[in-house]
């Protein structure tokens, strides 16, 4: 399977909410011994590899924000911790998964990475990630709503093994 990032850049004004999205593509094994661990974290382009460093999102780690379920099942983070930090991650039946961030500030700017790990028989078998940039703009020149910029077809299917 692969992870696609429909948008590579989100430009938002302070105070707005945004939903960053990744999509699971390709054949997904739905056997009951196969589950998917999906999560989000901040990172940098890095001098070596994008998404190699895992930084917290609003002080929540990738472990705090993870979803863990079978194939294309739906799931979302219902725990209070994420919601207290204005965050919610979710996954639907179609392989889309997302993180919603509320009341953005400049401090939320940066590179965001989604990570999917396929787990078979309790062992990590395959992991892929996608990356996208969030730019939060301040002041009079900021857009009134979030503007999203599609990934190039090459970027959109991010097959980088982590």
């Amino acid at each position: 399977f692969k992870v696609a990032t429909p948008y590579s850049l989100y430009v938002c004004p302070e105070g707005q909410n945004v939903t960053l999205t990744c999509r699971l593509l390709g054949p997904v094994d739905k056997g009951h011994d196969v589950t998917f661990y999906k999560t989000w974290y901040r990172s940098s382009r890095g001098e070596v590899q994008t998404c190699s460093e895992r930084r917290p999102i609003r002080n929540l780690t990738f472990q705090d924000l993870h979803l863990h379920h079978g194939g294309h099942q739906a799931a979302n983070t219902s725990h209070d911790l994420a919601q207290r930090h204005g965050l919610e991650s979710a996954s639907d039946h179609h392989g889309n998964f997302s993180i919603t961030m509320r009341n953005l500030t400049l401090l939320d700017s940066g590179l965001y990475c989604c990570l999917v790990v396929e787990i078979r028989h309790h062992h990590s078998e395959h992991r892929v990630h996608g990356a996208m940039e969030l730019q939060v703009q301040t002041g009079k020149d900021a857009p009134s709503n979030c503007v999203v910029y599609p990934s190039s077809s090459q970027d959109s299917e991010n097959i980088t093994a982590a």
Partner: antibody, heavy 121, light 111 residues
Framework: QVQLQESGPGLVKPSETLSLTCAVS?????????WNWIRQPPGKGLEWIGF???????NYNPSLKSRVTISVDTSKNQFSLKLSSVTAADTAVYYC??????????????WGQGTTVTVSS | DIVMTQTPLSLSVTPGQPASISCRAS??????????MQWYLQKPGQSPQLLIY???NVESGVPDRFSGSGSGTDFTLKISRVEAEDVGVYYC?????????FGQGTRLEIK
């Protein structure tokens, strides 16, 4: 080890444009961090001017925004400050500095040695 | 703008004695549990150098006699035993909201 080095004319005439460059060695400015300009008028405190991030987005101090442009030259691994319509009040030591970006912590961890700019006819 | 107010503005300390500088922000500098408050020292004729970030984290290479504390709007920098090399101007700074702002500075001298 990351090093920052400011350069530019030490004397600028009133109403002209001040142009400074910060050369970065030991790190690629397109990999991470925000790259800042800060100034310090003679005998006074520090004033943040603005930054450009590794991805090219900028943020400026609203008090200077109409006159400031920060840009990057990736081929030379350097970033620049342009401040238009200068007056004597823009006389200061100008520092470039690196700040964390895209993480929980934002702070200036590496500074250049500073360059003195005097605005005078 | 967030206004940073430092006290005292000058300080004269005997070597080996402790020193303390306060900084008050005009509004909270908290961001989801982190205080976005820094302390810098500018030694005579030099660029500022980072001492403390996020209110209480001591930057690598900074002597452990420096410590920072506080949250919300009130912060303190402490030097447990002042040494001659600690002379200079100390600045607090917030990165919670643009424009990022500094305190007016506290000058430390040795008695």
């Amino acid at each position: 080890q990351v090093q920052l080095q400011e350069s530019g004319p030490g004397l600028v005439k009133p109403s002209e444009t001040l142009s400074l460059t910060c050369a970065v060695s030991g790190y690629s400015i397109t990999s991470d961090y925000a790259w800042n300009w800060i100034r310090q008028p003679p005998g006074k405190g520090l004033e943040w001017i603005g930054f450009i991030t590794y991805s090219g987005s900028t943020n400026y101090n609203p008090s200077l925004k109409s006159r400031v442009t920060i840009s990057v030259d990736t081929s030379k691994n350097q970033f620049s400050l342009k401040l238009s319509s200068v007056t004597a009040a823009d006389t200061a030591v100008y520092y470039c500095a690196r700040s964390h970006y895209g993480s929980t912590y934002w702070y200036f961890d590496v500074w250049g040695q500073g360059t003195t700019v005097t605005v005078s006819s | 703008d967030i206004v940073m107010t430092q006290t005292p503005l000058s300080l004269s300390v005997t070597p080996g004695q402790p020193a303390s500088i306060s900084c008050r922000a005009s509004e909270s500098v908290e961001y989801y549990g982190t205080s976005l408050m820094q302390w810098y020292l500018q030694k005579p004729g030099q660029s500022p150098q980072l001492l403390i970030y996020a209110a209480s984290n001591v930057e690598s290479g900074v002597p452990d006699r420096f410590s920072g504390s506080g949250s919300g709007t009130d912060f303190t920098l402490k030097i447990s035993r002042v040494e001659a090399e600690d002379v200079g101007v100390y600045y607090c700074q917030q990165t919670r909201k643009v424009p990022w702002t500094f305190g007016q500075g506290t000058r430390l001298e040795i008695k």
